[in-house]
Interface confidence: low
């Protein structure tokens, strides 16, 4: 600390006192000095360092009428809401002429009930799932010993004998409260009470039970929920977007999900009104009176293809001599999948039917056998996807070609020479 250059009498007539108190205490330190002539500015030191931003006030009172008479100077340093950082040795410093004078030190100490640096926080945990709680306290005076309480019951026989800063809880089956007591020579401080809400565990093994083109039946295994029965489970389904995708850990789906609630048990739900042959992502969470579990990861699922819901449209069958030209248009009804092609069946009055797989073409030319005298020839067409055939069209009779009708030129498809088959089937 700065000192006077001579063993001259100190101008300080009052030195800072000592303050010892608990956190939050408000106190004032004072220095008083009597000087002759113009009064100096008083600086405050803490542990030898000038406090540049000290909350101090200086009062100057002349003791005579002449400027050269003595002045009394009082400087007050206000400490509001005492904190650990405020503790230390305080002194006042003045410059008089070519000399520096420092007051006797005063001490600010913090002593009282323990102070919590960290307290247990409210949180939710899954039933029977381990977790940790934290509590940290300090004096002075030290030492500070901690005692944990669960539902107001101590978890150790005496402070300092149980877990200290971190409490490991192996799992809970009911919502509980935890608090922490900090003990030192001055007494006991109790932390806030943290409520640990026990939620159901995340469901496991979300899987598909069955698939239909517009319906998925899913099931899952519920997690433990402690003493609280599950009230329901919530399933969310969202259309997958190949461009975006849903990562396993992504918190929210890319669009508004379709949400369904399932009464439990059984832990199964039929999701209807879906699009056929469409990828979805699904997830499930289960709820008890305490709240919902966390969601499962998004599970990619896909509705299977269905068969077309209607037959091909506008079928026409025209005969010209020994050739028959058949053409049609794609079904207006939903295909429920990827159209793989068409099947055509034709049959005469006294001849077996013939089934043909036309692929994706919408027309075919049949080369009829013999002299073309096959009677009452009818044609049926069905569209198919990977799931199978859609409904067959009603039989369309072969009409004689009339001059003026357009008849495109097509490569010929020979009819099998000795067909004898039953009605189309796939």
């Amino acid at each position: 600390a700065p000192r006077g250059t001579q063993a001259e009498e100190s101008p300080f007539v009052g030195n800072p006192g000592n303050i010892t108190g608990a956190r939050g205490l408000t106190g004032t330190l004072r220095c008083q000095l009597q000087v002759q002539g113009e009064p100096p500015e008083v600086h405050w030191l803490r542990d030898g360092q000038i406090l540049e931003l000290a909350d101090s006030t200086q009062t100057q009172v002349p003791l005579g009428e002449d400027e050269q008479d003595d002045w009394i100077v009082v400087s007050q340093l206000r400490i509001t809401s005492l904190q650990l950082s405020d503790t230390g040795q305080y002194q006042c410093l003045v410059f008089l002429g070519h000399q520096t004078f420092v007051s006797q030190p005063g001490y600010v100490g913090l002593e009282g009930l323990p102070y919590f640096l960290e307290e247990p926080e409210d949180r939710t945990v899954a039933a029977n799932t381990p977790f940790n709680l934290s509590c940290q306290a300090q004096g002075p005076p030290e030492p500070v010993d901690l005692l944990w309480l669960q539902d107001a019951v101590p978890l150790a026989t005496a402070p300092g004998h149980g877990p200290q800063r971190s409490l490991h809880v192996p799992g809970l089956n009911k919502t509980s409260s935890f608090s922490c007591e900090a003990h030192n020579a001055k007494g006991v401080t109790t932390s806030r009470t943290a409520t640990i809400t026990v939620l159901p565990q995340q469901p496991r093994n979300l899987h598909l039970v069955s698939r239909q083109p517009t319906e998925l039946e899913v099931a899952w295994t519920p997690g433990l929920s402690g003493i609280y029965p599950l009230t329901h489970c919530t399933l969310q389904a969202v259309l997958s977007d190949d461009g975006m995708g849903i990562q396993a850990g992504e918190p929210d789906p890319p669009e508004e999900p379709l949400t369904s609630q399932a009464s439990v048990p059984p832990h199964q739900l039929r999701l209807g009104s879906l699009h056929p042959h469409t990828p979805y992502h699904i997830r499930v969470a289960c709820t008890s009176s305490q709240g919902p579990s966390s969601w499962t990861h998004w599970l990619p699922v896909e509705t299977p293809e269905g068969v077309p819901l209607g037959p091909p449209e506008n079928i026409s069958a025209t005969r010209n001599g020994s050739q028959a030209f058949v053409h049609w248009q794609e079904p207006r009804a939903p295909l429920q999948g990827t159209l793989l092609g068409y099947r055509l069946a034709y049959q005469g009055q006294d001849t077996p039917e013939v089934l043909m797989d036309i692929g994706l073409r919408q027309e075919v030319t049949l080369e009829l056998q013999g002299d073309g005298s096959v009677s009452n020839l009818t044609v049926c067409v069905a569209a198919y996807t990977a799931a199978g055939d859609g409904p067959w069209s009603l039989p369309v009779p072969l009409e004689a070609w009339r001059p003026g009708q357009a008849q495109p030129v097509h490569q010929l498809v020979k009819e099998p020479s000795t067909p004898a088959f039953s009605w189309p089937w796939w």
Epitope: L340, M356, I358, G359, A386, G388, W425, W426
Partner: antibody, heavy 120, light 107 residues
Framework: EVNLVESGGGVVKPGASLKLSCEAS????????MSWVRQTSDKRLEWVAS????????YYLDNVKGRFIISRENAKNTLYLQMSSLKSEDTALFYC?????????????WGQGSSVTVSS | VIVMTQSHKFMSTSVGDRVSITCKAS??????VAWYQQKPGQSPKLLIY???TRHTGVPDRFTGSGSGTDYSLTISNVQTEDLAFYYC?????????FGAGTKLELK
């Protein structure tokens, strides 16, 4: 994994009967059309018969019509070929095959075959 | 009946070569042609359907092409494991018919 296992082959005299079975696993049997295809000693493949997934539609090669019956039991995942009035020209290795989903007349998986010998 | 003709009973090749096996249909089968590979003691395996669609798991050195009545299976960079019988089949209409087969062998 798709698996097809034929059984029931053997050596018989002309005019006798024989029933082949094909046990399927690894896929939803009732969703697929199934076929029997035979292979003669000269390595030629010849389609014999086909049946729809539900079993309601059957198709036969001309020269087995009336002698062979293709059937299926979906509850048992099994395909059958009942052969009667067997002829020496029916001697072959008979394969059971699954119809491909994208074209039911193309066969995407085949069994290992069951040998049928018709000889006096 | 649609007749499928494989004009070559045998085709010789060397490892690393490119070879094309051909098949002709007696009438237009609108690309409804499948190709199968059969190795000795094994059952046939589907390689190609609808003339050019590769079946699951088939190496991309196998390529199918064709339309109308003319079809071919091309194997580029032939490997020793490709030595086998190859059959074409029309899956256009019943009765389903196969080609007589082409045996691919080493020169």
């Amino acid at each position: 994994e798709v698996n097809l296992v034929e059984s029931g082959g053997g050596v018989v005299k002309p005019g006798a009967s024989l029933k082949l079975s094909c046990e399927a696993s690894g896929f939803t049997f009732s969703n697929y059309g199934m076929s029997w295809v035979r292979q003669t000693s000269d390595k030629r493949l010849e389609w014999v018969a086909s049946i729809s997934g539900g079993g309601g539609r059957t198709y036969y090669l001309d020269n087995v019509k009336g002698r062979f019956i293709i059937s299926r039991e979906n509850a048992k995942n099994t395909l059958y070929l009942q052969m009667s009035s067997l002829k020496s020209e029916d001697t072959a290795l008979f394969y059971c095959a699954r119809g491909a989903r994208a074209s039911y007349f193309a066969m995407d998986y085949w069994g290992q075959g069951s040998s049928v010998t018709v000889s006096s | 009946v649609i007749v499928m003709t494989q004009s070559h009973k045998f085709m010789s090749t060397s490892v690393g070569d490119r070879v094309s096996i051909t098949c002709k249909a007696s009438q237009d089968v609108t690309t409804a042609v499948a190709w199968y590979q059969q190795k000795p003691g094994q059952s046939p395996k589907l390689l190609i359907y609808w003339a050019s669609t590769r079946h699951t798991g088939v190496p991309d050195r196998f390529t199918g092409s064709g339309s109308g009545t003319d079809y071919s299976l091309t194997i580029s960079n032939v490997q020793t494991e490709d030595l086998a019988f190859y059959y074409c089949q029309q899956h256009f209409t019943t009765p389903l018919t196969f080609g007589a087969g082409t045996k691919l062998e080493l020169k």
